[in-house]
Structures are given as C-alpha cells and as structure tokens.
C-alpha cells in the first residue's frame, strides 16, 4: 500500500514562517498533490496549494512558495500575520493522487518541542499512514 509522509518545520528566522514537506512512497505516477491546513482536504481543511506535474502550481494565501522537490515530493513555504498566520499546533495535510493507485493522504503538525531551527532533519522523514 502506498504511503505519504509529512514534515512541518518552523523557520528560525521568521516565527510566522513554516515549511511543509510531503512525499509519496508508491509506484504510481503522481497526477496531483493538494496541500491543506486545518484538517484533510474535503473534511474541514482549507486548500493552500495544488500542484500538477504538467499543468503547474496554484497557491493561496498564506502560501508563499510551493514547488516540486523531486518527482514524488513537494515543499510549501507559508508566511502570514494576523488571522491568516499558522500557529504551532496547526495541522497540515498532503494528498497525493497517483495513477492507478488512487489518492493517499497524511497529516502532520509541528513537533511538540519544536524550537525554531531545531526541528528534525529532512531524512529520515516521519512516515504517516494515511489513516
């Protein structure tokens, strides 16, 4: 069964800036990635970015930069202030649609003891089953 991993990091330089990294562990070809916050996409979450391998990338505030890191992983930088600013316990979710396997989703938030700049390194990324 394919799996999705999610990693959330607060940037040391700006306390209101977050980096979300997500990856897909499966054999299918990815046809769409949807990043949301506040819960899963379609279940109370709000879409931050949609990445299509060929059609391109769409993003909505407070998303600042969404990009493909590899063919099977993406990153998203968020920055905001006031009402649109993420907080330390915000949940971020990534959904990967792959063909022919289908859609797979996982969610993550900032680790509880996360000091800016002291969050876990990119590898090994935490793997979260899509359940």
């Amino acid at each position: 069964t394919p799996e999705v991993w999610v990693q959330v990091r607060m940037e040391a330089t700006e306390l209101s800036s977050f980096t979300i990294r997500c990856g897909f562990l499966g054999s299918g070809s990815i046809s769409l990635v949807t990043v949301s916050w506040g819960g899963p996409n379609g279940a109370g979450g709000t879409t931050l970015a949609v990445l299509h391998p060929e059609r391109g990338i769409r993003q909505w505030a407070p998303a600042r930069q969404a990009r493909w890191e590899t063919q099977s992983s993406i990153s998203l930088i968020l920055e905001g202030s006031g009402a649109s600013s993420p907080c330390a316990n915000t949940t971020f979710c990534c959904k990967f649609a792959s063909f022919p396997e289908g859609s797979w989703e996982a969610c993550g938030s900032l680790p509880p003891s996360s000091d800016p700049g002291l969050s876990a390194p990119p590898t090994p990324a935490p793997i979260l089953r899509a359940d």
Partner: antibody
Framework: EVQLQQSGPVLVKPGASVKMSCKAS????????MHWVKQSHGKSLEWIGI????????SYNQKFKGKATLTVDKSSSTAYMELNSLTSDDSAVYYC?????????????WGQGTSVSVSS | DIQMTQTTSSLSASLGDRVTISCRAS??????LNWYLQKPDGTVKLLIY???RLHSGVPSRFSGSGSGTDYSLTINNLEQEDIATYFC?????????FGGGTKLEIR
C-alpha cells in the same frame, strides 16, 4: 451538475465486439480518473479497470485483461469501453463511474449503466 | 485480491427503524472503505467514503464506522427511499473489490 450518460442497451452475437460510451458533463473529463464496473444479472459488482483521461493511461483487473479496452476522446468528453470475443458470460450491465480523487478511492458519480446481452 | 464479505444478503426493517449493515475485508484496509446504494432501477450512488465521511448531498441519517477489517453502515430513522441494495467497496489496493451486497426491504 455532474452527469455520466451511457449509451443504450445492445444485443450482440457470440464472438462479436461491442463498444459502449460514457459522456461526461458538469466537470472537465481530464480532471478525474474513470472506472468501469460490471454487474452480472442479480450479482455483485466487479471492477474492470480505470483510465486516466488526461493522458490515456490504463490499469485493468487481471480478469479483464484482453477482454476490455478503455479509451477516451477528450474533444467530446467521452470515455469508451470495448469488449471483444463476447460470450454469454459477458452478458451484464456495465457502468462507468468517476473516481472522486478523495482518500477512500471511491467512485462518486455513476452512469446509468449499459446493458449488454450476448445471444445467438 | 482483497475479498469483501457482506454476510447478510438481505434484511427486513420497518420505517423509522435503525438499520446496521456490516462488511468485512479479508485484510486490513486502513479505513479505505466506501458504501454505495443501488436502487431497484439500477441507479448507483455513493453514500460514505473513507469509512465515515459523508458524500455531499447524502442525508445525515447515514453514517459509517469501522477500522481494520470490520466496517458498518448505519441508517437512522429508515425512510421509504432507502429501500435499495447496499454495497461496500475497498479502495486500499488494486483491483478494487466490492461486497456481495445487502438488500434492504420494508417489513
């Protein structure tokens, strides 16, 4: 409103082929995968396969490899399934169903079905 | 392939009843379980996806639950329009597979 309109019932002879259609409206065909499902008379549902209308990629249930061929015509927003070398075992209702792209990997909208009867 | 089993092939209930239909997978499907109804005219509609999420437009009297291999669909306050055959489907692996169906009739 999302709708999948399938072609009408067909009666064919054993050994022949049949090609049925599924016209999508209310959304962009290339944005969602399309499944095809078989229901023999009074029985359960069997998954035949799936097509990605964006690039024509397909994946089939091993049981239907060589029996079914899935294609799309993007210009008319229509998906097709062709069944070949028909026998009485192929007599059934065939449904097209849109993949929702939800987690769960469900099929959120279904066509009304195309009835295929194979008889000499 | 993952086998989906609906042990009850038919059941009778009265209008206003609470009805539960069960479905078992031959292996853990991690909540990738969906429920459909098929009306007597052949129309098929999605009710519940990912074990418990209600599809848009589906009345709230329908609910789903379960985990691992065992799942159930509950209909509260049964209405006449709920008379149909109910199928479960797993979305965890290919090929997608369906349960044999549970036909719901009015007592």
């Amino acid at each position: 409103e999302v709708q999948l309109q399938q072609s009408g019932p067909v009666l064919v002879k054993p050994g022949a082929s049949v090609k049925m259609s599924c016209k999508a409206s209310g959304y962009r065909l290339t944005d969602y995968y399309m499944h095809w499902v078989k229901q023999s008379h009074g029985k359960s549902l069997e998954w035949i396969g799936i097509i990605n209308p964006y690039n024509g990629g397909t994946s089939y249930n091993q049981k239907f490899k060589g029996k079914a061929t899935l294609t799309v015509d993007k210009s008319s927003s229509t998906a097709y399934m062709e069944l070949n070398s028909l026998t009485s075992d192929d007599s059934a209702v065939y449904y097209c169903a849109r993949d929702s792209s939800n987690v769960g990997n469900d099929m959120d909208y279904w066509g009304q079905g195309t009835s295929v009867s194979v008889s000499s | 392939d993952i086998q989906m089993t609906q042990t009850t092939s038919s059941l009778s209930a009265s209008l206003g009843d609470r009805v539960t239909i069960s479905c078992r997978a031959s292996q853990d499907i991690s909540n990738y379980l969906n429920w459909y109804l098929q009306k007597p005219d052949g129309t098929v509609k999605l009710l519940i996806y990912y074990s418990s999420r209600l599809h848009s437009g589906v009345p709230s009297r329908f609910s789903g639950s379960g985990s691992g291999t065992d799942y159930s669909l509950t209909i509260n306050n049964l209405e006449q329009e709920d008379i149909a055959t109910y199928f479960c489907q797993q979305g965890n692996t290919l090929p997608r597979t369906f349960g044999g169906g549970t036909k719901l009739e009015i007592r």
